[in-house]
Interface confidence: medium
Amino acid sequence: AVDLTLLANLRLTDPQRFFLTCVSGEAGAGRGSDAWGPPLLLEKDDRIVRTPPGPPLRLARNGSHQVTLRGFSKPSDLVGVFSCVGGAGARRTRVIYVHNSPGAHLLPDKVTHTVNKGDTAVLSARVHKEKQTDVIWKSNGSYFYTLDWHEAQDGRFLLQLPNVQPPSSGIYSATYLEASPLGSAFFRLIVRGCGAGRWGPGCTKECPGCLHGGVCHDHDGECVCPPGFTGTRCEQACREGRFGQSCQEQCPGISGCRGLTFCLPDPYGCSCGSGWRGSQCQEACAPGHFGADCRLQCQCQNGGTCDRFSGCVCPSGWHGVHCEKSDRIPQILNMASELEFNLETMPRINCAAAGNPFPVRGSIELRKPDGTVLLSTKAIVEPEKTTAEFEVPRLVLADSGFWECRVSTSGGQDSRRFKVNVKVPPVPLAAPRLLTKQSRQLVVSPLVSFSGDGPISTVRLHYRPQDSTMDWSTIVVDPSENVTLMNLRPKTGYSVRVQLSRPGEGGEGAWGPPTLMTTDCPEPLLQPWLEGWHVEGTDRLRVSWSLPLVPGPLVGDGFLLRLWDGTRGQERRENVSSPQARTALLTGLTPGTHYQLDVQLYHCTLLGPASPPAHVLLPPSGPPAPRHLHAQALSDSEIQLTWKHPEALPGPISKYVVEVQVAGGAGDPLWIDVDRPEETSTIIRGLNASTRYLFRMRASIQGLGDWSNTVEESTLGNGLQAEGPVQESRAAEEGLDQ
């Protein structure tokens, strides 16, 4: 059964001090991740016992194994059903506590009734405050039965339930007509799915014979032990004030378990702790009684004394529940009540015994659940005991269940049953998840859901390059942390798999499914530098750069040029997609702007170091284009250009620039300055005869303006070859401004 206990503090003088605590002894309880088990839940269940709404209750988690409910403001907040849910998957279990008001009209003689299938259950509601009206019995919130007030017997209303079946289980209540339901007596009936002493699907299996008030679970045959007892058959008492399947928990407060109600998984239900009784678990056991609710009688023999927490304390030379067994009778010593092994392992099990005559190797045997008897392979004989060692054949799932160690001598015999749990090593159901990647490392989340049994003790990550036959590399990691695989090859696919292990020999599970994870490109390491740049207009910039010379191939796919306009807070990025490029023309820039410029090499999505930055000032934008440009041939070597000044000038024109190009020619155009800005005509001389020319012009103020329209004109024929075109007035003094 799941190790889950719901504790109710019944010191009810002040409801604000009342609390409910749910404690789990399960491994990995309450961690809250799907892979490692859902959290503990503790809540009031208003589906059956409806009470007027009050302020919300406060839930506090104390670590992963404990949750406490507080915030009760008035006694009526306490009345009703509370439940705690814990355990994972198929082991998810609900523990229920039913709280009755101490001031109710009717009080249950006993709150929890655990009965076997086919038994007669009798619920008894004691009259605490009499009303001369009918009593309504309800089952799970629905009308069930009515009793006339005259039908009370010895101040009790009885509800007899003959031949009960598992569906009869639930919350029962007895309420006077015309009385608040808070004054009801509330009961919990638990009907085991089998008759007395039986368990299993067809109720064919025999229960282990639970001691000290333990109840045999009808599904798995385990004893659900009362608080304060442990062992396969609840044969062992915990120290005073301790509870839990392994006595690992301690009652809070200085008065130990006084005033606490303990609720355990069905079919146990609720009781006081060992050594206590009464409706509020505040009364110590009467002499001769012990255990939960003081339900057990000591009946100690041979001078044994009764301890209200553990039962008979035997004098030297005697043992047994009632000190009825002489120490001459052989006795199994210190046998663990529960052992856990992994599937397909071949464990060694030890069984120690003492007695007079002294047990020898052949007198100790081990019996499996299927009845197979194993004989010990060796025995260690010590002065006070003989320890037999058994080599168990390879375990299968059917070996789960109750094993028995038996010792027989002429002095008598003893046997001890213990539970063997065969656990299935965990196998991941999914591949690990890639979180981030770099050129030489992958960050992986190993946390995956799994089949088989937990808890997970280690997680191994196996990895190797895809399609490789080399050995797998392995890294052991913490289950709850992400893993970084280091020193990998760039731009390489890796097959990655998870392997989970649980505690114990043979706890390693099979490898999970593989997944492909690919490392990133190597980072480019070369730092370019800017060779130079020049302005090719108010919005155009030509940039050139170089790279250091290094042996081997260039690691890079291209270059990224960045222009930062600090005034506007804007960045312009230009991608040059050839790693061989060393120059680029940047267009569409903002005239008159101060830019910071740098260049860096890129590879895949990774950027190398940026060049030292350069600072570039683009000239401001120039004036509009001249209007109505017209060309007229004057001779075989002269053409006259006429135009009109641009409109809406921002300032006085400093000069005009004329561009001359032979139509259809492949050479660069020639630029000629017209330095008298007031002129609206000029003659271009030194042209070739019978040649077609293209002309356009622009004005300059602080910067060059827009080009005018292009005009065509041919020189007249039969002239000699000229030396080249010049402008009329300054031909002798100025060359061509190219």
Epitope: Y145, L177, E178
Partner: antibody
Framework: EVQLLESGGGLVQPGGSLRLSCAAS????????MVWVRQAPGKGLEWVSS????????RYADSVKGRFTISRDNSKNTLYLQMNSLRAEDTAVYYC?????????????????????WGQGTMVTVSS | DIQMTQSPATLSLSPGERATLSCRAS???????LAWYQQKPGQAPRLLIY???SRATGIPDRFSGSGSGTEFTLTISSLQSEDFGVYYC?????????FGQGTKVEIK
């Protein structure tokens, strides 16, 4: 379907006896209180007797006390009314009915209820 | 015993009209303990209203009950042809359980 079916009525002489039966179906008979109510020809309704699920506590109208006995057999889902020392004024249609309970308007307090399910009735005539 | 008195003895109305039936108790009856029944000729009574104002299962909402203490009323907001018959009030606070003498609602 919830149903009650009376039988056993008939003509009987004054001083005679008659046993009425009421067969219940469609609900858990053994859980409910039951009553007999009668209606003399052309008259109103008169409660006669009531019984609790256990068969224990019973109540009677003053007019029939000592002469009539109500009983039940939960294993047969049947209610009975044994009528002795019959008089002419006992002539009536006898109805069996289920006696319910419900919650008051707050939804928290259970309250004794009316007679929510009735049989079709059986006629008893006492005449010489 | 608590005496229950109904008025009027007979109420003659046409379909579609509103019917108001009264019931008076000889001593105070909490509203939680008053019921109304309908009975048609040759049939068993049928529970209409319990707790003075709560409609029983399957009863149309044209039937409504009100009142407390000693004065109670059953109202049928718009009479249908199937609503004609005798209506009884009943107290179930004390023993013996007592009924009114009935109000007959007939077609005008």
């Amino acid at each position: 379907e919830v149903q009650l079916l009376e039988s056993g009525g008939g003509l009987v002489q004054p001083g005679g006896s008659l046993r009425l039966s009421c067969a219940a179906s469609g609900f858990t008979f053994s859980s409910y209180r039951m009553v007999w109510v009668r209606q003399a020809p052309g008259k109103g309704l008169e409660w006669v007797s009531s019984i609790y699920p256990s068969g224990g506590p019973t109540r009677y109208a003053d007019s029939v006390k000592g002469r009539f006995t109500i009983s039940r057999d939960n294993s047969k889902n049947t209610l009975y009314l044994q009528m002795n020392s019959l008089r002419a004024e006992d002539t009536a249609v006898y109805y069996c009915a289920r006696w319910s309970y419900y919650y008051d308007s707050s939804g928290y307090y259970p309250v004794s209820g009316p007679f929510d399910i009735w049989g079709q009735g059986t006629m008893v005539t006492v005449s010489s | 015993d608590i005496q229950m008195t109904q008025s009027p003895a007979t109420l003659s109305l046409s379909p579609g009209e509103r019917a108001t039936l009264s019931c008076r108790a000889s001593q105070s009856v909490s509203s939680s303990y008053l019921a109304w029944y309908q009975q048609k000729p040759g049939q068993a009574p049928r529970l209409l209203i319990y707790g003075a104002s709560s409609r029983a299962t399957g009863i149309p909402d044209r039937f409504s009950g009100s009142g407390s203490g000693t004065e109670f009323t059953l109202t049928i907001s718009s009479l249908q042809s199937e609503d004609f018959g005798v209506y009884y009030c009943q107290q179930y606070k004390d023993w013996p359980r007592t009924f009114g003498q009935g109000t007959k609602v007939e077609i005008k």
